[in-house]
């Protein structure tokens, strides 16, 4: 399977909400002992490999934000911890998964990574990730709503191993 990032850049005004999205593509094993671990974290551009560094999002680690389920099953973060930080991660039946960040501030600007791990009976079989940038703007140059910029076809199917 692959992970696609429909948008590579999100430009948002301060105070707005944004939903960053990744999509799981390709055949998904729905075996009894196969599950998927999906999560989000921040990273930085200045590395050899994008997304290799895992930094928290608003003090929440990728473990705090994870979703875990079988196949193309729907799931969302049920714990209060994420919601208290204005965050919610979710996954639908079609392979889309997302993180919603509420009440954006300038400190939220940066590179965000989604990670999908296929787990076959507690063993990591396959890892893929996608990357996108969030720019939070303030002042007269800031847009009134979030503006999203589609990934190039090459970027949108990011299959770099995490």
């Amino acid at each position: 399977f692959k992970v696609a990032t429909p948008y590579s850049l999100y430009v948002c005004p301060e105070g707005q909400n944004v939903t960053l999205t990744c999509r799981l593509l390709g055949p998904v094993d729905k075996g009894h002992d196969v599950t998927f671990y999906k999560t989000w974290y921040r990273s930085s551009r200045g590395e050899v490999q994008t997304c290799s560094e895992r930094r928290p999002i608003r003090n929440l680690t990728f473990q705090d934000l994870h979703l875990h389920h079988g196949g193309h099953q729907a799931a969302n973060t049920s714990h209060d911890l994420a919601q208290r930080h204005g965050l919610e991660s979710a996954s639908d039946h079609h392979g889309n998964f997302s993180i919603t960040m509420r009440n954006l501030t300038l400190l939220d600007s940066g590179l965000y990574c989604c990670l999908v791990v296929e787990i076959r009976h507690h063993h990591s079989e396959h890892r893929v990730h996608g990357a996108m940038e969030l720019q939070v703007q303030t002042g007269k140059d800031a847009p009134s709503n979030c503006v999203v910029y589609p990934s190039s076809s090459q970027d949108s199917e990011n299959i770099t191993a995490a």
């Epitope: 599950t35 389920h69 063993h123 990591s124």
Partner: antibody
């Protein structure tokens, strides 16, 4: 906050039966594999059984015929039915959640098999 | 069923670095996980998937795996690290624990 709370332990005579329960909260119970792990007094950890998110069960080969794991996703509860209990089954029984390793553990419930 | 072998005991002084090994003939590509059990408490996941620290675990704890052996390293040893440490892996569909290592902080 993830919480696992075991109950049902106690004193039972050899040959007797006991059913342990584990009430789960703070996460989507039906999406996770769950296991029972036990620890005899002063000894190490021993895996007992697992039930996957889809209901597939696996057992420690030495215990399979006597122990049965089950789950009720509507009640967010994991169970362990233990039959034909022996003195060597005396242990603290822990309920655990599993992704790769066992990332959350209950506080355990003590099962004592003695006449 | 495979067996994970750990040394029964280890020790170190505060500030020191201590390593605990876990060996298995057939460890292959399977992930190894590490747990800490403080006296009188339930075990706690420290390291999963060979080298990933569990949430909230300080970076003094690290895991590695090479060939037939996995290791847990604790740097800057503290008195509160005195505990039993267990490695664990999955052998097909069966979970296996090491016998445990009792770490004493001198």
């Amino acid at each position: 906050e993830v919480q696992l709370l075991e109950s049902g332990g106690g004193l039972v005579q050899p040959g007797g039966s006991l059913r342990l329960s584990c009430a789960a909260s703070g996460f989507t119970f039906s999406n996770y594999a769950m296991s029972w792990v036990r620890q005899a007094p002063g000894k190490g950890l021993e895996w007992v059984s697992e039930i996957s998110h889809s209901g597939t069960t696996n057992y420690n080969p030495s215990l399979k015929s006597r122990f049965t794991i089950s789950r009720d996703n509507s009640k967010n509860t994991l169970y362990l039915q233990m039959n034909s209990l022996r003195a060597e089954d005396t242990a603290v029984y822990y309920c655990t959640r599993a992704i790769w390793g066992f990332d959350y553990w209950g506080q355990g419930t003590l099962v004592t098999v003695s006449s | 069923q495979s067996v994970l072998t750990q040394p029964p005991s280890a020790s170190g002084t505060p500030g020191q670095r201590v390593t605990i090994s876990c060996s298995r003939e057939n460890i292959g590509s399977r992930s190894v996980h590490w747990y800490q059990q403080l006296p009188g408490t339930a075990p706690k996941l420290l390291i999963y998937d060979n080298n990933e620290r569990a949430s909230g675990v300080p970076n003094r704890f690290s895991g590695s795996k090479s060939g037939t052996s996995a290791s847990l390293a604790i740097s800057g040893l503290r008195s509160e690290d005195e505990a039993d440490y267990y490695c664990q892996a999955w052998d097909s569909s069966t979970a296996v624990f090491g016998g445990g290592t009792k770490l004493t902080v001198l």
